[in-house]
């Protein structure tokens, strides 16, 4: 697998690997159009979770505000559906016992926002 | 910072840290409504980039198909805007020289999908 050494090499001691300090492109930032979460026809709210032993410590989850979508009159149209857009992302967990610190990757599912779709089936007429 | 040991502890040798093998929740998968990228009123296409020295090797980027949004008649409505939704994610870079393998985190900006918004300004009438 990705994290294993080639078979011809001696195995990794203690089931751990070398992680270089520093993050490539650490200062790169998401740039999104202003207030899209409230201007979207499938608007959403954000919830922030905070964990000091995780990098990044702050993970933001979106929740769609409506089941339907918002029409030009600002009313909910239940002939259309607001659906979440999800993304798998990696975070790093820090584990420490005294001065012995190790890190482990963790996969997290993040809901990034919502989009308005034509329904496959109409539950609500 | 997150990756530094407490000040009272001896410094990390060679500027590297211990990364435990294995990924927490590795088998967790995104579960999204079927074909939302083509059913959305702000539809998008996917482009896949592949890099064997990156984990995950496959990174998928979305590209909004239209500048406007698709209305109930399937026509483009330029009074509304399709906008990309971005997310910062971490990937792991593998660097090897012979049997010496090390890893480094990298921040990547991923466009996850698109949403339809009421414009702030109208470039096109």
């Amino acid at each position: 697998t990705f994290f294993q050494k080639p078979e011809s090499c001696p195995p990794v001691p203690g089931g751990s690997m070398k992680l270089d300090i520093g993050i490539i492109n650490e200062n790169q930032r998401v740039s999104m159009s202003r207030n899209i979460e409230s201007r979207s026809t499938s608007p959403w709210d954000y919830t922030v979770t905070w964990d000091p032993n995780r990098y990044p410590s702050e993970v933001v989850q979106a929740q769609c505000r409506n089941l339907g979508c918002i029409n030009a009159q600002g009313k909910e149209d239940i002939s259309m559906n607001s659906v979440p857009i999800q993304q798998e992302t990696l975070v790093v967990r820090r584990k420490h016992q005294g001065c012995s610190v190790s890190f482990q990757l963790e996969k997290v599912l993040v809901t990034v926002g919502c989009t308005c779709v034509t329904p496959v089936i109409h539950h609500v007429q | 910072t997150f990756f530094q040991k407490p000040e009272s502890c001896p410094p990390v040798p060679g500027g590297s840290m211990k990364l435990d093998i294995g990924i927490i929740n590795e088998n967790q998968r995104v579960s999204m409504s079927r074909n939302i990228e083509s059913r959305s009123t702000s539809p998008w296409d996917y482009t896949v980039t592949w890099d064997p020295n990156r984990y995950p090797s496959e990174v998928v980027q979305a590209q909004c198909r239209n500048l406007g949004c698709i209305n109930a008649q399937g026509k483009e409505d330029i009074s509304m805007n399709s906008v990309p939704i971005q997310q910062e994610t971490l990937v792991v870079r593998r660097k090897h020289q012979g049997c010496s393998v090390s890893f480094q985190l990298e921040k990547v900006l991923v466009t996850v999908g698109c949403t339809c918004v009421t414009p702030v300004i109208h470039h096109v009438q």
């Epitope: 159009s33 202003r34 | 590209q63 909004c64 239209n66 500048l67 805007n81 399709s82 990309p84 702030v120």
Partner: nanobody, 123 residues
């Protein structure tokens, strides 16, 4: 840092044509919708045309009325503006820029513009 280099401007007679080019470097070109803008003498900068991320969708300002065509070549990281049936009122400095949010991009939010290319329509 993104670099935008516009070229192809010049002096042309009314009814004539020009093809403007804009070479983009310093970022992933295909990740952005692209646009052309212009600043007529003594006026504010205004939107001219936009092309979507994939190149499959284009939009134009009202004054264009089927005279201009925007296109892109992702392999060359270049966006073009073919200008036909030029009028004296098309005289301006023409600029290109990325439109990260498509038509939702606001001109006042741009940190950087190229030097532009001067188009003069006169007999």
């Amino acid at each position: 840092q993104v670099q935008l280099v516009e070229s192809g401007g010049g002096l042309v007679q009314p009814g004539g044509s020009l093809r403007l080019s804009c070479a983009v470097s310093g970022r992933t070109f295909s990740s952005y919708a692209m646009g052309w803008f212009r600043r007529p003498p003594g006026k504010e900068r205004e939107f001219v045309a936009a092309i979507s991320w994939s190149g499959g969708d284009t939009k134009y300002a009202d004054f264009v009325t089927d005279r201009f065509t925007i296109s892109r070549d992702d392999a060359k990281s270049t966006v073009y503006l073919q200008m036909n049936s030029l009028k004296p009122e098309d005289t301006a400095v023409y600029y290109c820029n990325d439109m990260p949010y498509g038509l939702d991009t606001r001109m006042d939010e741009y940190e950087y513009w190229g030097q532009g290319t001067q188009v003069t329509v006169s007999s």
